[in-house]
């Protein structure tokens, strides 16, 4: 009679994580008597996957009635496959004895596990940066298999080219991680911009995963200041305004200085938003020129988002306005941003 052969017909099997893997094995003879066992790997460190007669293998079931005496099909199904299950599986026939001895092994079936990458997480710099500066964004995704993966960067739909990507580990592993760093040059119009990291993998069936970062969390657009003197509102009164334009984020504090002395400090509240996401704000002072003998230097000083203050000054010519003799009464405040200077 021909010697028993152990046949594993599938050289390889690929299974998606979470599914069951069926590993086929048949023997060509009932002789010699002895059990079949399944192992992952070969050699002394091989891992027992299934023993017909003893042990605990809750994820393994036999495909046919493998315990029937005449049975020659020893295929198994392994449930809830994870990347850690990848490897080469051997169906091994033992000859009964004291102890049982290995008689013949199948050629092995390589199980590869397709595991989806995790949702990409995009993170930007810890501190805000201003337009014209280059900032780095990182994108990470984990737990995928096989190793082949494609990562792309976009800014507002436009593909970026300045990035570096690593897939770890370099050698064989049950699953892999990808890490990419992209460099982005900020512009003043980037408040509404988005940076997108897109990951494509065989497990995603052409529907890539995306991670996004809003540049609003990264950019700081410093304000431009303009101080102007409005036409005389009433006799001896001048309205001076400070236009704070195109700033982001909103956190802003404005201080009026009169000849270098602090006159009033206020925080930007009722701002107007521009189409590009930046903000404008205006503060004004009502100056009673009759209270001044000399010219007045008015300074609008702005501290934006914790940065060093920027300022703009305006010289108010007192001589240009006739003085009202003996008058040092305050003009009436007519707005929350108004201030009289004596």
């Amino acid at each position: 009679e021909e010697e028993l052969q152990v046949i594993q017909p599938d050289k390889s099997v690929s299974v998606a994580a979470g599914e069951s893997a069926i590993l086929h094995c048949t023997v060509t003879s009932l002789i010699p008597v002895g059990p079949i066992q399944w192992f992952r790997g070969a050699g002394p460190a091989r891992e027992l996957i299934y023993n017909q007669k003893e042990g605990h293998f809750p994820r393994v079931t036999t495909v046919s009635e493998s315990t029937k005496r005449e049975n020659m099909d020893f295929s198994i199904s392994i449930s809830n496959i994870t990347p850690a299950d990848a490897g080469t599986y051997y169906c091994v026939k033992f000859r009964k004895g004291s102890p049982d001895t290995e008689f013949k092994s199948g050629a092995g079936t390589e199980l590869s596990v397709r595991a989806k990458p995790s949702a990409p997480v995009v993170s930007g710099p810890a501190a805000r940066a201003t337009p014209q500066h280059t900032v780095s964004f990182t994108c990470e995704s984990h737990g995928f298999s096989p190793r082949d993966i494609t990562l792309k960067w976009f800014k507002n739909g436009n593909e970026l080219s300045d990035f570096q990507t690593n897939v770890d580990p370099v050698g064989e592993s049950v699953s892999y991680s990808i890490h990419s760093t992209a460099k982005v040059v900020l512009t003043r119009e980037d408040v509404h911009s988005q940076v997108i990291c897109e990951v494509a993998h065989v497990t995603l069936q052409g529907d890539p995963l995306r991670g996004t970062a809003n540049l609003s969390e990264t950019i700081r657009v410093p304000p431009t200041l303009e101080v102007t003197q409005q036409p005389v509102r009433a006799e001896n009164q001048v309205n001076v305004t400070c236009q704070v334009r195109k700033f982001y984020p909103q956190r802003l504090q404005l201080t009026w200085l009169e000849n270098g002395n602090v006159s009033r400090t206020e925080t930007a509240s009722t701002v107007t938003e521009n189409k590009d996401g930046t903000y404008n704000w205006m503060s004004w002072l009502l100056v009673n020129v009759s209270a001044h003998r000399d010219d007045v230097k008015l300074t609008c000083q702005v501290e934006h988002d914790g940065q060093p203050a920027v300022s703009k000054s305006h010289d108010l010519k007192v001589s240009a306005h006739p003085k009202e003799q003996g008058s040092n009464t305050a003009a009436e405040n007519t707005g929350s941003n108004e201030r009289n200077i004596y």
Epitope: V33, P44, A45, R46, E47, L48, Q52, K53, E54, G55, H56, T67, R69, K96, S98, P99
Partner: antibody, heavy 113, light 108 residues
Framework: EVQLVQSGAEVKKPGATVKISCKVS????????MHWVQQAPGKGLEWIGR????????KYAPKFQGRVTITADTSTNTAYMELSSLRSEDTAVYYC??????WGQGTLVTVSS | EIVLTQSPATLSLSPGERATLSCSAS???????LYWYQQKPGQAPKLWIY???NLASGIPARFSGSGSGTDYTLTISSLEPEDFAVYYC?????????FGQGTKLEIK
Amino acid sequence: EVQLVQSGAEVKKPGATVKISCKVSGFNIKDYYMHWVQQAPGKGLEWIGRIDPEDAETKYAPKFQGRVTITADTSTNTAYMELSSLRSEDTAVYYCDRGLAYWGQGTLVTVSS
Amino acid sequence: EIVLTQSPATLSLSPGERATLSCSASSSVSSSYLYWYQQKPGQAPKLWIYSTSNLASGIPARFSGSGSGTDYTLTISSLEPEDFAVYYCHQWSSYPYTFGQGTKLEIK
């Protein structure tokens, strides 16, 4: 549901023989090795031996070899463990287990003169 | 025969503490064949961890197993009152199969 139900407690005299049964349900006894384990009072677990009910092949621990006989009746889905030449140190709870995973409730055997 | 030596014989700890139980084999045991059982007074042993590191059904995730070759460990990250019991390691790599002498985990 897998269940292993053992026979009741036994009191034996030194030199006698005891035979404990383990009736299983929820699986076919032929499909698994059936093991027997001893636990003396306040002591640990000690493997006695096992049987392959499919062909009655047995393996025994050297300590029990010659005094123990493990058998199985596949028609009634029952395994048996017989221990002869009993001595006081054989006083113990005896457990059957299926393939190391499922255990019977235990049978107390007291050997006393 | 492979002799399994468990240490310590008794471990006195309080709920919430971390427990580390060791099992040392006199010769190498394949990790696939190293099991742990829990036993409480008057009860049959229960399979707790199989193949060194796999938790049996219903076993809480605070339990973990590790090791290879001759040294194996059962760890309980944060003890709960119901964890106090005797734990046995067991090898079925070669005949005769053997158990460790057990580690009694008791409340301090």
